[in-house]
């Protein structure tokens, strides 16, 4: 194939791949008709003048995972057809000015996972056709004004995993075609008003894992096409009332891991396309009426691991499409009987690790499609008559780790549980707490005659005496849970990352066998 170096493999499709620790310089001679060249996992430490001079037809050049620390300014001379250049995962600290001169066709430039300390406007001034610029995983502390001014066609810019402490409001002003901007895992403490005003076509903005404390009220007002906004793991303590007002296309918003103390009514919206809202790990103490009322299409709402002690009866107004509601690990003591009434499509509700001491009898009255209810680790002593009667699809009910009072009042619940044991799972059953003489005994098999009779004896016709048969051949056991949300974690999935670490967010939903507080 027009002379393939011994250290490389060359395919008929004009693709050359050179790998291995024994390679210490760009192999020669390279086939003149090569269109794709990959130099991976070698011990090359520098690129000298014009090592690719004779392969001017090259379209894609990947020089990744090497020891590369120095590049001569003329290293890429004569590569006028090059569209894709990756220098990712090397040891570059400095880019010579003019390095990309003459690369008039370049569309993708990957400089991620190096040790770059700074970039200058002159670095990219010749790259007017660039569509994608990856700079994540470097040591950049600031971006000078003008750095991207010539990249008017840029659609994707990744500056994540650097050491940026502030951003100039002018640095992105000419990037009107930008669709994806990633600034995650930096040290940003605030973002000046107007920073994103020029980004009228922006679809994704990733700001997670910074130290942002405050959002300017109009920060996103020009980003009408924004679909994904990642604000998780910052220090945001309050949301200005209008901050999300003009984001009609938004379908993903993550705010978990902040310091939010309250949510004002109407703060979210209108966002007709938002399907998931992740608010776990904040300091929210109450939910007022209509706080989510603009989120008509919301299907997943995660409010776990906050300090919620009060939910207004109309807090969930408007959430008619909601399927999953996670309220576990809060400070709830009481719930209004109407609080879930509007959630006609709710399938899974997670209320474990709260302080609930009783539930209203009508709490699930309008939520006929419930399939999973997590009530473990509360302070429930009994449940109202017929609370689960109408829940024909219920296949998972967790009631363990509550101080069940096994007097004669518990009989109706005990009888219903006896007939519906499969719903409880086999691993962890509810046990009596009082009276002391039956403490620790299974609520399902307890002989209530042994227990102390209650003050008033209820009329016995109570929980339905019809056995429950699952709709499907098998029902979930206690180790694997029916909740789909358990698998729908807010993983911010970036295809340009070398490795994507998907964290298991089961503890966020809290639907694991042993709860972790």
């Amino acid at each position: 194939y027009h002379g393939c170096p011994s250290e490389c493999t060359c395919s008929r499709a004009s693709q050359v791949e050179c790998t291995g620790a024994r390679i210490v310089a760009v192999p020669t001679p390279l086939p003149w008709n090569a269109m794709s060249l990959q130099i991976l996992n070698t011990h090359i430490t520098e690129l000298n003048e014009s090592p690719f001079l004779n392969i001017s037809a090259l379209i894609a050049l990947r020089i990744e995972k090497n020891e590369l620390s120095r590049i001569t300014p003329g290293a890429f001379r004569n590569l006028g057809s090059l569209r894709y250049l990756s220098l990712a995962n090397n040891k570059l600290q400095v880019l010579p000015i003019g390095l990309f001169q003459g690369l008039d066709s370049l569309e993708s430039l990957l400089l991620s996972s190096n040790q770059l300390l700074q970039i200058q406007p002159a670095h990219f001034s010749q790259c007017s056709n660039l569509k994608e610029l990856q700079l994540h995983g470097n040591h950049l502390e600031y971006i000078p004004d003008g750095a991207f001014d010539h990249l008017v066609g840029l659609t994707k810019l990744n500056l994540g995993k650097n050491s940026l402490t502030h951003i100039s409001p002018r640095v992105f002003q000419h990037l009107g075609n930008l669709q994806v901007l990633r600034l995650y895992e930096n040290r940003l403490t605030d973002i000046p008003m107007g920073t994103f005003d020029g980004l009228v076509n922006l679809q994704e903005l990733a700001l997670q894992q910074n130290q942002i404390g405050l959002l300017s009220p109009g920060l996103f007002h020009n980003n009408h096409n924004l679909q994904r906004l990642y604000l998780s793991n910052n220090h945001i303590s309050q949301l200005p009332p209008s901050v999300f007002m003009q984001l009609p296309q938004l379908n993903r918003l993550t705010l978990f891991g902040n310091s939010l103390k309250e949510l004002s009514p109407g703060i979210f919206g209108p966002m007709p396309n938002l399907r998931e809202l992740w608010l776990y790990d904040n300091h929210i103490s109450s939910l007022p009426d209509n706080v989510f009322s603009n989120l008509r299409q919301l299907q997943v709402l995660i409010l776990s691991r906050n300090q919620i002690s009060f939910i207004s009866p109309g807090a969930f107004n408007g959430l008619t499409e909601l399927r999953e509601l996670s309220l576990h690990t809060n400070a709830l003591q009481d719930l209004d009987g109407n609080v879930f009434r509007m959630l006609a499509n709710l399938q899974n509700i997670s209320l474990q690790n709260n302080r609930l001491r009783q539930l209203p009898g009508n709490i699930f009255a309008n939520v006929n499609g419930l399939m999973a209810i997590q009530l473990q680790n509360n302070q429930l002593e009994n449940l109202p008559l017929g609370i689960f009667d109408h829940l024909g699809k219920l296949c998972e009910l967790r009631l363990y780790d509550n101080p069940w009072r096994c007097d004669s009042d518990i009989l109706p619940l005990r009888n219903w549980l006896l007939l519906n044991q499969p719903r409880l799972g086999t691993d962890t059953v509810p046990v009596c707490f009082s009276p002391a003489n039956v403490r620790g005994q299974s609520l399902i098999i307890i002989n209530v005659n042994v227990a102390v009779p209650s003050v008033h004896v209820p009329e016995v016709p109570s929980y339905p005496e019809t056995p429950w048969y699952p709709d499907t051949p098998s029902y979930p056991d206690t180790t694997s849970v029916s909740s789909t949300t358990e698998l729908t974690s807010p993983v911010e999935d970036y295809t340009d990352l070398t490795t994507i670490q998907v964290t298991d967010d089961r503890s966020v939903w809290g639907m694991t066998q042993a709860q972790s507080g």
């Epitope: 009481d334 302080r355 707490f433 009082s434 005994q441 042993a514």
Partner: antibody, heavy 120, light 112 residues
Framework: EVQLVESGGGLVQPGGSLRLSCAVS????????VHWVRQATGKGLEWLGV???????NYNSALMSRLTISKENAKSSVYLQMNSLRAGDTAMYYC??????????????WGQGTTVTVSS | DIVMTQSPDSLAVSLGERATINCKSS????????????HAWYQQKPGQSPKLLIY???TRESGVPDRFSGSGSGTDFTLTISSLQAEDVAVYYC????????FGGGTKVEIK
């Protein structure tokens, strides 16, 4: 006879971790919850957390990021794992349970405690 | 978190006299539906582990002498030892379990 016996205390370096055990007898961990409480010398009681019969846990919010409570029912043992120790964690560590009391968070049976000293 | 504040820090009472210890919580411990105050008192004698005396503000634990009584509701609670005995010398702690438990700082009771 109901008994709770703590062990695993001793001298720990700052920044290190500890794993305390609470061996129980006279009752089953599948039926009763076990709390951990600590007390610095000459100071008051501080509730650390609890593991309930079914395995659910609750933690003191100020210490939650450093604490893990677990148990092995078959071994009748409850464990307290604490990371990133500092001098302020020097204390007597107790485990306790609610054997007779009607108070769900009441602690009417206590171990004798195990002493943890954090020092270089 | 709910903060429990005890007063006084220490108290010296003659044998046979009444001892009164106060405890104030930063928020109400009364649950309106169960009508219970989630408040308890513990006694810790020198060199010993703590002992539960009273829960739900006024319910004496089994085996606790009737000279110990608890009272109060909402945010203000009192432990009274009607006739102090030598064996009552101890530190007394209040505790709330309305939210996750927190203890008061303790009151040391000595004989005058």
């Amino acid at each position: 006879e109901v008994q709770l016996v703590e062990s695993g205390g001793g001298l720990v370096q700052p920044g290190g971790s500890l794993r305390l055990s609470c061996a129980v007898s006279g009752f089953s961990l599948t039926s009763y919850g076990v709390h951990w409480v600590r007390q610095a010398t000459g100071k008051g009681l501080e509730w650390l957390g609890v593991i309930w019969a079914g395995g659910s846990t609750n933690y003191n919010s100020a210490l939650m990021s450093r604490l893990t409570i677990s148990k092995e029912n078959a071994k009748s043992s409850v464990y307290l794992q604490m990371n990133s120790l500092r001098a302020g964690d020097t204390a007597m560590y107790y485990c306790a349970t609610h054997m007779i009391t009607e108070d769900y968070y009441g602690m009417d049976y206590w171990g004798q405690g195990t002493t943890v000293t954090v020092s270089s | 978190d709910i903060v429990m504040t005890q007063s006084p820090d220490s108290l010296a009472v003659s044998l046979g006299e009444r001892a009164t210890i106060n405890c104030k919580s930063s928020q109400s411990l009364l649950n309106s539906r169960t009508r219970k105050n989630y408040h308890a008192w513990y006694q810790q004698k020198p060199g010993q582990s703590p002992k539960l005396l009273i829960y739900w503000a006024s319910t004496r634990e089994s085996g606790v002498p009737d000279r110990f009584s608890g009272s109060g509701s909402g945010t203000d609670f009192t432990l009274t030892i009607s006739s102090l005995q030598a064996e009552d010398v101890a530190v007394y702690y209040c505790k709330q379990s309305y939210n996750l438990p927190t203890f008061g700082g303790g009151t040391k009771v000595e004989i005058k």
